[in-house]
């Protein structure tokens, strides 16, 4: 029986040109996590595998940074990055757990925010 739960940051917003950390937390299970996939709608962003490490999808290579932990830092945000993101935890023996994050990328106000965001 799958007893675990995934907690995510839920609905988040960030400014165009900035950065955001996508993070999920699996709890209430002793299952071993073997891999985490990060997906945007139907597109694979990155995979973190327990043995093989990180694989970043070529189309995101220039603006994805691995971590913190099993999370993902998405940089140089554009309004096209608005949408649903999924963390897919592959575990043994439980199976697969999926968490959902909705990211809204907002047009930055140059008057209020002159400096470019740094990675948190």
């Amino acid at each position: 029986m799958m007893t675990g739960t995934i907690e995510t940051t839920g609905n988040i917003s960030a400014e165009k040109g900035g950065s955001i950390i996508l993070q999920c937390h699996l709890s209430s299970t002793t299952a071993q996590v073997t891999q985490v996939n990060w997906e945007q709608q139907d597109q694979l962003l990155a995979i973190c595998n327990a043995d093989l490490g990180w694989h970043i999808s070529p189309s995101f290579k220039d603006r994805v940074a691995p971590g913190p932990g099993l999370g993902l830092t998405l940089q140089s945000l554009t309004v096209n990055d608005t949408g649903e993101y999924f963390c897919i935890y592959h575990t043994y023996p439980d199976g697969t757990y999926t968490g959902r994050i909705f990211l809204e990328v907002l047009e930055s106000s140059v008057a209020e925010h002159g400096a470019r965001f740094q990675i948190p």
């Epitope: 907690e7 490490g53 990180w54 691995p66 971590g67």
Partner: antibody, heavy 117, light 107 residues
Amino acid sequence: QAYLQQSGAELVRSGASVKVSCKASGYTFTSFNMHWVKQTPGQGLEWIGYFFPGNGATNYNQKFKGKATLTADTSSSTAYMQISSLTSEDSAVYFCAREGWLSLGYWGQGTTLTVSS
Amino acid sequence: DIVMTQSQKFMSTSVGDRVSVTCKASQNVYTNVAWYQQKPGQSPKVLIYSASHRYSGVPDRITGSGSGTDFTLTISNVQSEDLADYFCQQHNRYPYTFGGGTKLEIK
């Protein structure tokens, strides 16, 4: 089995710069974050930052921004940390450490840096 | 920054005893905590990841527990080779931060 071999101890004059190397073997260098950690008797273990050889991504502890610069040469599977404008506060043991599965699973043997005035 | 506090700088124990090293995070870090052992003159070595998962090759008399802000490393049936410094570390947020360490002394 991953293995990290760091460069030897350094005795450097105040105001100069130093570059510490960390040669990785036994794994795919471009698939794992390489972290750098400073250890002193007074401050304990301090995280400097990481470099991801897969795409050159970096993240620095604010405290070490402008002090340390992290790079890597993927052709030789070697990570580097340059420390500039050295002062006595920079005297420490510096470790490179490969981030494994939710921990810093493999550590170099450490490089002792002594800054003399 | 997240502060990891190991309130006990030194702990004294005897061979065969059970000892618990504690670590408190200044904010919720879920289970994103690792424990390291460092023997004199050596590099740190990971013992526990994800708060409670034993790293490969670590004896089962060493266990980790906790989530949120409070974490414990327990060593049962203490052996002389356990003489070392023990550090906790969070990897929930950058910058990664370490506890100040607890030195385990054997009576």
